[in-house]
């Protein structure tokens, strides 16, 4: 079993290379008893879900942009 399924993580893998224009929203789940890792779960414009690598510079930019747009709404 992977580390993810050993706990109750939702991200079993992370998707590499996703264009920000395909992302509708992003949810960042902090570590907790259910999962030891930070998880970044994107809802795509086609309704599907994808896990993103929280350490990736582009993902950090996407999160920052999404959070800023939430604040301005």
């Amino acid at each position: 079993a992977s580390v993810a399924t050993e706990l109750r993580c939702q991200c079993l893998q992370t998707l590499q290379g996703i264009h920000p224009k395909n992302i509708q929203s992003v949810n960042v789940k902090s570590p907790g008893p259910h999962c030891a890792q930070t998880e970044v779960i994107a809802t795509l414009k086609n309704g599907r879900k994808a896990c993103l690598n929280p350490a990736s510079p582009i993902v950090k930019k996407i999160i920052e942009k999404m959070l800023n747009s939430d604040k301005s709404n």
Epitope: A1, A4, T5, E6, L7, R8, C9, Q10, C11, L12, Q13, T14, L15, N27, K29, G32, P33, H34, I41, T43, R48, K49, A50, C51
Partner: antibody, heavy 125, light 107 residues
Framework: EVQLLESGGGLVQPGGSLRLSCAAS????????MSWVRQAPGKGLEWVSA????????YYADAVKGRFTISRDNSKNTLYLQMNSLRAEDTAVYYC??????????????????WGQGTPVTVSS | DIQMTQSPSSLSASVGDRVTITCRAS??????LHWYQQKPGKAPKLLIY???NLESGVPSRFSGSGSGTDFTLTISSLQPEDFATYYC?????????FGQGTKLEIK
């Protein structure tokens, strides 16, 4: 056919012990988390405990922590709930449930998509 | 712990009615919410997963929506077999928690 079958329920005195079993068939048991959920007479659903696919991680509701132990034997496709120091408030129907399902290669959700028929536990003197 | 509050706790409706049940979480849970149906003496049955996805084999008259803290289960046109108790459940974090249930009765 995917199936879960609980057994081991019954009448027990306060302070007593009971071990519930849940026999699984029709799916790769070791790949999925499993949960126990209970329902007291005339009440709603209450989550009791969960266990990861390998059995390496376990989770408990505060009400049963330190008294109940969840475990699994993947070679026998069986889930267990060892219940010690039983109290009147533990009286309920106990269900085991499978936690499915993979949506995408990159994302997993935990929904109780298959349930057993339930086994009644009565704690009374 | 995350508390889940359903409303109403009971509801009387007629065949053909449109019915909405709401579920509120005590903190944001994204869309980590499921809906179950339970009939007397039977095990619960998964209806909707991740707030809005219809479980395989569930009639399309059932739908779910919401994100964050507020969620709804809608039955577009009640059928006789839909009279049951409905529960929401969060899996955002442990301990997993259910709403107290909404009993749907025939008017």
């Amino acid at each position: 056919e995917v199936q879960l079958l609980e057994s081991g329920g019954g009448l027990v005195q306060p302070g007593g012990s009971l071990r519930l079993s849940c026999a699984a068939s029709g799916f790769t048991f070791s790949e999925l988390s499993m949960s126990w959920v209970r329902q007291a007479p005339g009440k709603g659903l209450e989550w009791v405990s969960a266990i990861s696919g390998s059995g390496g991680s376990t989770y408990y509701a505060d009400a049963v922590k330190g008294r109940f132990t969840i475990s699994r034997d993947n070679s026998k496709n069986t889930l267990y709930l060892q219940m010690n120091s039983l109290r009147a408030e533990d009286t309920a129907v106990y269900y085991c449930a499978r936690e499915g399902g993979r949506l995408e290669p990159y994302y997993y959700y935990y929904a109780m998509d298959v349930w057993g028929q339930g086994t009644p536990v009565t704690v009374s003197s | 712990d995350i508390q889940m509050t359903q409303s109403p706790s009971s509801l009387s409706a007629s065949v053909g009615d449109r019915v909405t049940i709401t579920c509120r979480a005590s903190q944001s849970i994204s869309d980590n919410l499921h809906w179950y149906q339970q009939k007397p003496g039977k095990a619960p049955k998964l209806l909707i997963y991740d707030a809005s996805n219809l479980e395989s084999g569930v009639p399309s008259r059932f739908s779910g929506s919401g994100s964050g803290t507020d969620f709804t289960l809608t039955i577009s046109s009640l059928q006789p077999e839909d009279f049951a108790t409905y529960y929401c459940q969060q899996y955002y974090s442990t301990p997993l928690t259910f709403g107290q249930g909404t009993k749907l009765e025939i008017k």
